[in-house]
C-alpha cells in the first residue's frame, strides 16, 4: 500500500526531517509550510493550522523559500557611479555594478558597495594589467623602444615608429619623429630592440624589410629615473 501523504502541519516521525519547502517549527513541534520567494510568513503555524503567507511589500523581497516574518529591504538606489543591473522586485534584491571606467573597490554579496575610478596611466607609462570589474589598472613604465603619450586607463605602451631618417628620437612618452615621408611601424608591440650605430641606419633609402629586428631610437635620449606613483594619475 502507498504511504499516506501527510498534509502540513504534521508531526514528523522521530529522527526524520521535514520535506522540501517545509520547516520544523520548534514551538508547534510540527512540520509546516514555508512561504515561496516573494512572500513572508504572516501567521506562523500551530498544531492544527498551517503557515499563512503574504506578499512582500514594495522595496522588500525574499529570494528563497522561507518562514521569515518580514521580507528583507532592498538595497538603496544605485549611486551615480553605478548602473542598476538587476531591479528590486519581490523576489530579488537590487544589484548595482560599477559603470564603465570604474571598478568595484568594496564588493558586497551581490553587486558593489563602493566604486572607484580606474587608474589612468600618464604619459611614459602604459597599462600592464587592465582593470576588471573588481581590480584597478596596473601601470608600468614604457620599456625602451616603446612609448605612451596619453593619460589613459586602457592604452598600452606602443613601439616607436621606425624611421629611415630620424628627426627626433622617441622616448617613453613620445613617438619618434621621422624626416622621411614613409615611416614604418614595428610589427611586434612592446618589443625591445637592440641599439645599432646611427650611421648604418641613416644610409637606408628603403624601409627595413624586417622591422622586428630593426634598430630602436630610444637609446638616443636617456629615460632618467622613473617617477614614483606607478605612473598613474587620478585617485
Amino acid at each position: 500500500l502507498p504511504a499516506q501523504v501527510a498534509f502540513t502541519p504534521y508531526a514528523p516521525e522521530p529522527g526524520s526531517t521535514c520535506r522540501l519547502r517545509e520547516y520544523y517549527d520548534q514551538t508547534a513541534q510540527m512540520c509546516c509550510s514555508k512561504c515561496s520567494p516573494g512572500q513572508h510568513a504572516k501567521v506562523f503555524c500551530t498544531k492544527t493550522s498551517d503557515t499563512v503567507c503574504d506578499s512582500c511589500e514594495d522595496s522588500t523581497y525574499t529570494q528563497l523559500w522561507n518562514w521569515v516574518p518580514e521580507c528583507l529591504s532592498c538595497g538603496s538606489r544605485c549611486s551615480s557611479d553605478q548602473v542598476e543591473t538587476q531591479a528590486c522586485t519581490r523576489e530579488q534584491n537590487r544589484i548595482c555594478t560599477c559603470r564603465p571606467g570604474w571598478y568595484c573597490a568594496l564588493s558586497k554579496q551581490e553587486g558593489c558597495r563602493l566604486c572607484a575610478p580606474l587608474r589612468k596611466c600618464r604619459p611614459g607609462f602604459g597599462v600592464a594589467r587592465p582593470g576588471t570589474e573588481t581590480s584597478d589598472v596596473v601601470c608600468k613604465p614604457c620599456a625602451p623602444g616603446t612609448f605612451s603619450n596619453t593619460t589613459s586607463s586602457t592604452d598600452i605602451c606602443r613601439p616607436h615608429q621606425i624611421c629611415n631618417v630620424v628627426a627626433i628620437p622617441g622616448n617613453a612618452s613620445m613617438d619618434a619623429v621621422c624626416t622621411s615621408t614613409s615611416p614604418t611601424r614595428s610589427m611586434a608591440p612592446g618589443a625591445v630592440h637592440l641599439p645599432q650605430p646611427v650611421s648604418t641606419r641613416s644610409q637606408h633609402t628603403q624601409p627595413t624589410p624586417e622591422p622586428s629586428t630593426a634598430p630602436s631610437t630610444s637609446f638616443l635620449l636617456p629615460m632618467g629615473p622613473s617617477p614614483p606613483a606607478e605612473g598613474s594619475t587620478g585617485d
Epitope: 514551538t27 508547534a28 504572516k42 501567521v43 500551530t46 492544527t48 493550522s49 499563512v52 518580514e70
Partner: antibody, heavy 119, light 106 residues
Framework: QVQLKESGPGILQPSQTLSLTCTFS??????????VGWIRQPSGKGLEWLAN???????YYNPSLKNRLTISKDTSNNQVFLKITNVDTADTATYYC???????????WGQGVMVSVSS | DIVLTQSPPSLSASLGDKVTITCQTS??????IAWYQQKPGKAPRQLIR???TLMSGTPSRFSGSGSGTDYSFSISNVESEDIATYYC????????FGRGTKLELK
C-alpha cells in the same frame, strides 16, 4: 483600538485554585493568527511567561508549570481564562494578559491584576 | 527549555550616553527576539520585534541587532524618559523572558 483588562480574586489561600479572566476589545479571537497569552511578575522581580491560546484553540504552556495551568477562551464574549491549581505564596504576583501577533510576539498588554496568596 | 541570559542586571547612565544591553540564548532562535520597556507600576511596552524592527511609536534612538544566539539592544542618546527596566523576550521556541536590566541615572 486594542485593549485588554485582567480580573481576578485579589487574595486567595494556599492550595486553592486561582481563576483569572482577560476581557479584551479591538480584536477577535476568531481572527486567523490571533492569540492571547498570560505573563506574571512577582513584585520587584522579572516577567515569567505562563500560557498562550490561539484562534484555533491551540494551547502552549510554560513547561515548568504545565501540570498546574489551564488556559481556555470564550470567543463570542472576547474573553480568555487562566486557572492555576494548588497555589502557594510563590504565586503572589501581578498577572498580565497580552495579545499575541500572528508571528508570536506580545504586542498589546493589559494593565495587570495583583494577586496575593496568603494564609 | 531555552535559557535567556540578559546582562547587565543594572546600568547607570548620564543623559546623552549610549547604553547597550545584551541577551544570549542557549540555542539559535532565528532572530525571534523582542525588547520591552517597563516603568514602575506599568505594564511592559514593546519597543522592538524580530531583533531589529522598531514598533510604531518607538523613537529611533532605540535599536536592536544580533543573530543566532547573541542579541543586543541599544539606546543611542539616553533621555530621562528612558529610565526604566528593559526585558528581552525570545519567541523562537515557546516564550522566555530575560531577567531584566534596570537603567538608572548617574
Amino acid at each position: 483600538q486594542v485593549q485588554l483588562k485582567e480580573s481576578g480574586p485579589g487574595i486567595l489561600q494556599p492550595s486553592q485554585t486561582l481563576s483569572l479572566t482577560c476581557t479584551f476589545s479591538g480584536f477577535s479571537l476568531s481572527t486567523y493568527g490571533v492569540g492571547v497569552g498570560w505573563i506574571r511578575q512577582p513584585s520587584g522581580k522579572g516577567l515569567e511567561w505562563l500560557a498562550n491560546i490561539w484562534w484555533d484553540d491551540d494551547k502552549y504552556y510554560n513547561p515548568s508549570l504545565k501540570n498546574r495551568l489551564t488556559i481556555s477562551k470564550d470567543t463570542s464574549n472576547n474573553q480568555v481564562f487562566l486557572k492555576i491549581t494548588n497555589v502557594d505564596t510563590a504565586d503572589t504576583a501581578t498577572y498580565y494578559c497580552a495579545r499575541i501577533d500572528g508571528t508570536r510576539y506580545f504586542d498589546y498588554w493589559g494593565q495587570g491584576v495583583m494577586v496575593s496568596v496568603s494564609s | 527549555d531555552i535559557v535567556l541570559t540578559q546582562s547587565p542586571p543594572s546600568l547607570s547612565a548620564s543623559l546623552g550616553d549610549k547604553v547597550t544591553i545584551t541577551c544570549q540564548t542557549s540555542q539559535n532562535i532565528n532572530k525571534f527576539i523582542a525588547w520591552y520597556q517597563q516603568k514602575p507600576g506599568k505594564a511592559p511596552r514593546q519597543l522592538i520585534r524580530y531583533t531589529s524592527t522598531l514598533m510604531s511609536g518607538t523613537p529611533s534612538r532605540f535599536s536592536g541587532s544580533g543573530s543566532g544566539t547573541d542579541y543586543s539592544f541599544s539606546i543611542s542618546n539616553v533621555e530621562s524618559e528612558d529610565i526604566a527596566t528593559y526585558y528581552c523576550l525570545q519567541y523562537g521556541n515557546l516564550w522566555t523572558f530575560g531577567r531584566g536590566t534596570k537603567l538608572e541615572l548617574k
